[in-house]
């Protein structure tokens, strides 16, 4: 809390400067109305103050809005975004995508911080749910976004916004997510030609069931045994050799490395070994 | 001296719009906010809406949105509001009003201008 | 929107009592962080238009007499006139400025002078 003191002789601060880096801290209190930040938002972003400074700004925001910032003051705080706490950022209405933008770019290059989940969480409850702009933001900013999300929040995603999501994007989801992702993506990317699709679906595949892997074994997809090793165990069980052969097609190869690992080793055990032999890989059920 | 110097009295017609202006002096106009509000029958007052000066931002009660508009002109140090579409429940006072220093409560007041609808 | 409730509505003393008026909010106006309850006062005089009295609930505008002390916390607040002035008659009213940017005014108190 900065000292009440009384604002020196002509230094009144009748706009937000360049001028205003050179008050001390008590003189930023005394000297800078809160009404006048309060007009002038878009121009501290663009004045070197120092965190001392920004902490004074801070301070007489709080106290002119104390049921939160509207998003006039929010889209114009920039750096002083880096000052709130998740307790200031919920008392926020952020309504539009631009607003998002400018404060997300204020973080990029670091970690989600609290503060910025907090502000996702406004912003996305505030809408209702994940539309495709959103998530191409969140997920421009932070690849791992999506897989963030509990199954819960992931079930609001509409399937048209999975046209937005890129493999990269998935990297981090562990099969639960995928479970409520893949239908939706199916969903997004029906009316795609065989080819076409598999490229799409890939990254979902992880949320695939049986009968789903079984219609893909009869399009010579060639799946790779990288997409392969992340399918549900549970639905690869129940695959025969011959249809693990389609679908993998010249990729089939790569199973004798990954015998030893999940969910190869136990499709292993559940195949004859007769029918394993077909294969030409000396794989041992 | 900060003073706000409000137009004359209006006398006009149903349904016709009219333009109230405040023109400022003795401060910064671009940096407080400049309300409006509205005193029916000598008593109530309503807050009507806001302007940025410096932006032209504006902010307005529920109510009187689609009845008033805000704007300003900052070489002038003038704000304006119009009223639309009068009846007789827009007879009335209306004063400008600044905004205080550290909130917003109003430091500064206009005259007021009386607006009166009637054919 | 919050709702200010002024009361009583008009009231009539002799030039040198004490008066006390009323203000009450349908929410808290104090906010916890800086302790400090988003209120003002104003005096309008007959065909005048409203001066700020008090501001933040107890903070006297400068200028005004230090007869006129503004009291109260949270949702109950009070003008108090110590000694009235026959320059005193006016309508009294109080505004929040809690919650931006509804703010809200009291119906207001009238002092008459007998």
């Known amino acids: 809390e900065v000292e009440k003191t009384a604002c020196p002789s002509g230094k009144k601060a009748r706009e937000i400067d360049e001028s205003l880096i050179f008050y001390k801290k008590w003189e930023l209190e005394a000297c800078v109305d809160a009404a006048l930040l309060a007009t002038q938002m878009d121009r501290v972003n663009a004045i070197p103050f120092t965190y001392e400074q920004l902490d004074v700004l801070k301070h007489k925001l709080d106290e002119l809005y104390p049921q939160g910032y509207p998003e006039s003051v929010i889209q114009h705080l920039g750096y002083l975004f880096l000052k709130m706490s998740p307790e200031d950022i919920r008392k926020w209405n952020v309504t539009s995508l631009e607003t998002l933008k400018a404060l997300l770019e204020v973080n990029k290059g670091h970690e989600m911080s609290p503060q910025v989940a907090t502000l996702i969480d406004r912003f996305v409850k505030g809408r209702g749910q994940l539309d495709k702009d959103t998530l191409d933001t969140l997920t421009a900013f932070y690849p791992g976004y999506l897989c963030s999300l509990s199954p819960e929040e992931l079930s609001s995603v509409p399937p048209s916004s999975i046209w937005a999501v890129r493999p990269q994007d998935l990297d981090t989801c562990d099969p639960r997510q995928l479970d409520v992702l893949y239908p939706k993506a199916r969903l997004a990317f029906q009316n795609m030609n065989g080819s076409e699709y598999f490229v799409k679906i890939q990254s979902f595949l992880g949320g695939a069931p049986t009968e789903d892997l079984k219609a893909l074994s009869q399009q010579n997809v060639s799946m790779d045994l990288a997409t392969f090793m992340k399918l549900r165990t549970d639905a690869v069980l129940p695959l025969t050799v011959a249809e693990v052969q389609k679908l993998l097609g010249p990729h089939v190869e790569g199973l004798k490395a990954e015998e030893r690992h999940r969910p190869v080793r136990d499709w292993i055990l559940r195949q004859r070994q007769d029918d394993l032999d077909t294969l030409g890989l000396g794989l041992q059920g | 001296e900060v003073q706000l110097q409000q137009s004359g009295p209006e006398l006009v017609k149903p349904g016709a719009s009219m333009k109230i202006s405040c023109k400022a002096s003795g401060y910064s106009f671009t940096g407080y906010t400049m309300n409006w509000v509205k005193q029916s029958h000598g008593k109530n007052l309503e807050w009507i809406g806001l302007i940025n000066p410096y932006n032209g931002g504006t902010s307005y009660n529920q109510k009187f949105k689609g009845k008033a508009t805000l704007t300003v002109d900052k070489s002038s140090s003038t704000a304006y509001m119009e009223l639309l579409s009068l009846t007789s429940e827009d007879s009335a006072v209306y004063y400008c009003a600044r905004v205080g220093g550290s909130s917003w409560y109003f430091d500064v007041w206009g005259a007021g201008t009386t607006v009166t609808v009637s054919s | 929107d919050i709702v200010m409730t002024q009361s009583p509505s008009s009231l009539a003393v002799s030039v040198g009592e004490k008066v006390i008026m009323s203000c009450k909010s349908s929410?808290?106006?104090?906010?916890?962080?800086?302790?400090?309850?988003?209120l003002a006062w104003y005096q309008q005089k007959p065909g005048q238009s409203p001066k700020l009295l008090i501001y933040?609930?107890?903070t006297r505008e400068s200028g005004v007499p230090d007869r006129f002390t503004g009291s109260g916390s949270g949702t109950d607040f009070t003008l108090t006139i110590s000694s009235v002035k026959a320059e005193d008659l006016a309508v009294y009213y109080c505004?929040?400025?809690?919650?931006?940017?509804?703010?809200?005014f009291g119906g207001g108190t009238k002092l008459e002078i007998k």
């Open positions: 505004q929040q400025y809690y919650s931006y940017p509804t703010w809200t």
């Open positions: 929410q808290s106006l104090l906010y916890s962080s800086n302790q400090k309850n988003y």
């Open positions: 933040w609930a107890s």
